[in-house]
Amino acid sequence: LTCLGGFASPGPVPPSTALRELIEELVNITQNQKAPLCNGSMVWSINLTAGMYCAALESLINVSGCSAIEKTQRMLSGFCPHKVSAGQFSSLHVRDTKIEVAQFVKDLLLHLKKLFREGQFN
């Protein structure tokens, strides 16, 4: 058995403290929605594959004035090896699809769960 913040599950190696903190913050965002997150702002959807942290940051960094995701933006920047600025896009973006920030966060969490279940946390 391995332990992820008290999460008992057979198999995969537990993620780093930084990744645990990111997951916790993302869950808090999805669970705390008393009003539309970031006033219902829309962001580009991304292909949740290699380089997803940078792609996620590139998408979310274009949302300004939303304190609810500032911590997430800072955390994602710690996982992305290069500097990301607003307006920057990689090939990982699905440029014809925009979704609400809240939906984007749920999708990111689901992908992290998939990686954890497959033992692919790096």
Epitope: G5, G6, I23, L26, V27, N28, T30, K113
Partner: antibody, heavy 119, light 107 residues
Framework: EVQLVQSGAEVKKPGASVKVSCKAS????????MHWVRQAPGQGLEWIGN????????IYNEKFQGRVTMTRDTSISTAYMELSRLRSDDTAVYYC????????????WGQGTTVTVSS | DIQMTQSPSSLSASVGDRVTITCRAS??????LNWYQQKPGKAPKLLIY???NLEVGVPSRFSGSGSGTDYTLTISSLQPEDFATYYC?????????FGGGTKVEIK
Amino acid sequence: EVQLVQSGAEVKKPGASVKVSCKASGYTFTSYWMHWVRQAPGQGLEWIGNINPKGGSNIYNEKFQGRVTMTRDTSISTAYMELSRLRSDDTAVYYCARLDYFGDSFDLWGQGTTVTVSS
Amino acid sequence: DIQMTQSPSSLSASVGDRVTITCRASQGIRNYLNWYQQKPGKAPKLLIYYASNLEVGVPSRFSGSGSGTDYTLTISSLQPEDFATYYCQQDNRFPYTFGGGTKVEIK
């Protein structure tokens, strides 16, 4: 063993309040959001609300807004759900349910607490 | 609120049968759909999350599919322990909502 153990059955009169407890064990209580769901006799499931054991923040179903209060005591790894101004249609089994670590489903449930509201 | 409509509300089947339960959402829920099994006097148990992902420890005879507003739970070969009530639940938006349930009874 990872489990949620709830308090015993309650019988209340209309207009009274009830407070149900849910004690977590076998995992880190503050790492998972807790939700409450109820089930009226012979009926389906109805979501009441959630609470973050770490910070205490929560969201309630608007249907219960103003009547429900969710709290927690991290020192004893216990979540509470209090429902006030009880009516006969609040008669139900009340469940606490742990939200999966990644926030997408209820992966652990308490055994349920039967609350009967009758004059 | 998102309404979840399950059908049928009940069905009779025999051991070994293939059973299909459907769940329709009043609006698109982007696959954020979970399935639970509940036996009399017991709490629900998670079977499938995100429409088609089998929860750890759940037998592979259970499977889920669907997208948009329409989702399906399939039991490929019904076993004696599968006679129970099944609920779908959407977690795409608050308030979370459940289907009315499908009771699977012995024929």
